[in-house]
């Protein structure tokens, strides 16, 4: 009987040869639990494990605790991988980060952040960052050191209100921090003066709602 | 760790100024207002006013206008609250505490209401001829 | 200008429940926050928006409100609860705060 093969990440799809865009399955580290992600294959040398992205507004992203535990939304639109498996993933080797956006003006930026990882989810998938490059601002967006993550149903913030309450969405939030990709998604023209949008603070400023966003992990040594 | 130290005990004649500084370390002093709460002796707390460290605005209760002026130097993490024409009754602990400005990254001019999470220790003024 | 009011004192024996109360104007439609003040030292939230608690604070300390009274509840008090209580909430009208006159806990022995 033919051995199945199994892959923990876009990294080990691509390098077994397939090298088009798509979603594929992954199997958890250590495990034979699989998840379905999206892989980018051509950006940047490809092999990029796309773990969240929004696009057009159709997936609510106000969600539980466990719902971004486990990941939810289409992986070949809008989704969330999902905490637990990154946080596996991360936890296995060393992982880069990085987050392609899109304004509604047609300018597009980066932040590559040269180490990433999510903490379990027993330290409530904290998230760790080091080495920001990249043109989506010199200060980065995402509160450093890393906040606890947060839902509508497990406040961990550093804020004496309810971030992902007010702001929407699940994120790492600070009190309440410069960041939030899980927010509302506003159209064109109603995508300014929003305190609960779609914001990379130090690439568009207050209010900002962005168009699309694309967060993607990749092994450091890929 | 988080913490607002506030400057020393002040012994003022009536009519004179004194000016309370408020030291802020381990957060970001512009993410947070800063309010003043009183103490008299034996009495129970009274707000005075904030200020809003990212942009300077302040708020004062209407008891204080045109005796209170609120300032802060960002470049040393400090708020300042100065009380003008002093009378024998602003006797009290002056407290300097703060609140999340959670739209901060937001809508900067936005207040939200949230309740003071971390206090000074307080100064003492006493106002005594 | 708005007015919260509070007893002056409440007495409770240890390992018995204290309630504070803090009345006002429609108060059910305002957040309320609790603030512990033992003597010689500066206030400490214990209780915001209405029944949360900040981080350190022990569970036995709850919070209500609804109608024209907020409520502070203390579970099994203990001799270190001794403190006057200090309820506060956000008056819109005027954007100024305002603080209940307090209650002092006094757990008898």
């Known amino acids: 009987k033919e051995e199945q093969i199994s892959f923990r990440d876009c990294a080990e799809v691509f390098k077994s040869g397939h090298t088009t865009n798509g979603i594929y399955t992954l199997t958890f580290p250590n495990s034979t639990e699989e998840i379905k992600a999206y892989c980018d294959m051509e950006a940047g040398g490809g092999g990029w494990t796309i773990i969240q992205r929004r696009e057009d507004g159709s997936v609510d992203f106000q969600r539980t605790w466990k719902e971004y535990k486990v990941g939810f939304g289409n992986p070949s639109g809008e989704y969330w991988l999902g905490n637990e498996f990154v946080s596996q993933l991360t936890n296995q080797q060393r992982y880069v980060l990085k987050i392609h956006l899109k304004d509604w003006e047609g300018n597009e930026a980066y932040s590559l952040y040269e180490h990433f990882y999510l903490s379990s989810e027993e330290l409530n998938y904290r998230i760790h960052l080091k080495g920001l490059t990249g043109t989506a601002g010199k200060i980065s967006s995402i509160s450093q050191p890393g906040n606890d993550f947060s839902t509508k149903d497990g406040d961990n913030d550093k804020c004496i209100c309810k971030c992902s309450q007010m702001l929407t969405g699940g994120w790492w939030f600070d009190a309440c921090g410069p960041s939030n990709l899980n927010g509302m998604y506003y159209p064109q023209r109603q995508n300014t003066n929003k305190f609960n949008g779609i914001k990379w603070y130090y690439w568009k400023g207050s209010g900002y709602s962005l168009k699309a966003t694309t967060m993607m992990i990749r092994p450091a040594d890929f | 760790q988080v913490q607002l130290v506030q400057s020393g005990a002040e012994v003022k004649k009536p009519g004179a100024s004194v000016k309370v500084s408020c030291k802020a370390s381990?957060?970001?002093?512009?993410?947070?207002?800063m309010h003043w709460v009183r103490q008299a002796p034996g009495q129970g707390l009274e707000w005075m006013g904030w200020?809003?460290?990212?942009?300077?605005?302040?708020n004062y209760a209407q008891k204080f206008q045109g005796r209170v002026t609120m300032t802060r130097d960002t470049s040393i993490s400090t708020a300042y609250m100065e009380l003008s024409r002093l009378r024998s009754d602003d006797t009290a602990v002056y407290y300097c505490?703060?609140?999340?400005?959670?739209?901060?990254?937001?809508?900067?001019?936005?207040?939200?209401?949230?309740?003071?999470?971390?206090w000074g220790q307080g100064t003492m003024v006493t106002v005594s001829s | 200008s708005y007015v919260l009011t509070q007893p002056p004192s409440v007495s409770v024996a240890p390992g018995q429940t204290a309630r504070i109360t803090c009345g006002g104007n429609?108060?059910?439609?305002?957040?309320v926050h609790w603030y512990q003040q033992k003597p010689g030292q500066a206030p400490v939230l214990v209780v915001y928006?209405?029944?949360d608690r900040p981080s350190g604070i022990p569970e036995r300390f709850s919070g209500s409100n609804s109608g024209n009274t907020a409520t502070l509840t203390i579970s099994r008090v203990e001799a270190g609860d001794e403190a006057d209580y200090y309820c506060?909430?956000?008056?819109?009208?005027?954007?100024?705060?305002?603080f209940g006159g307090g209650t002092k806990l006094t757990v008898l022995s």
């Open positions: 505490a703060r609140s999340p400005n959670p739209y901060y990254y937001d809508s900067p001019g936005y207040y939200y209401p949230a309740a003071f999470d971390i």
């Open positions: 381990g957060y970001n002093f512009k993410g947070y207002y």
């Open positions: 200020i809003n460290p990212n942009s300077g605005g302040t």
């Open positions: 429609n108060i059910g439609s305002k957040s």
């Open positions: 928006d209405d029944s």
């Open positions: 506060q909430v956000w008056d819109s009208s005027s954007d100024h705060w305002v």
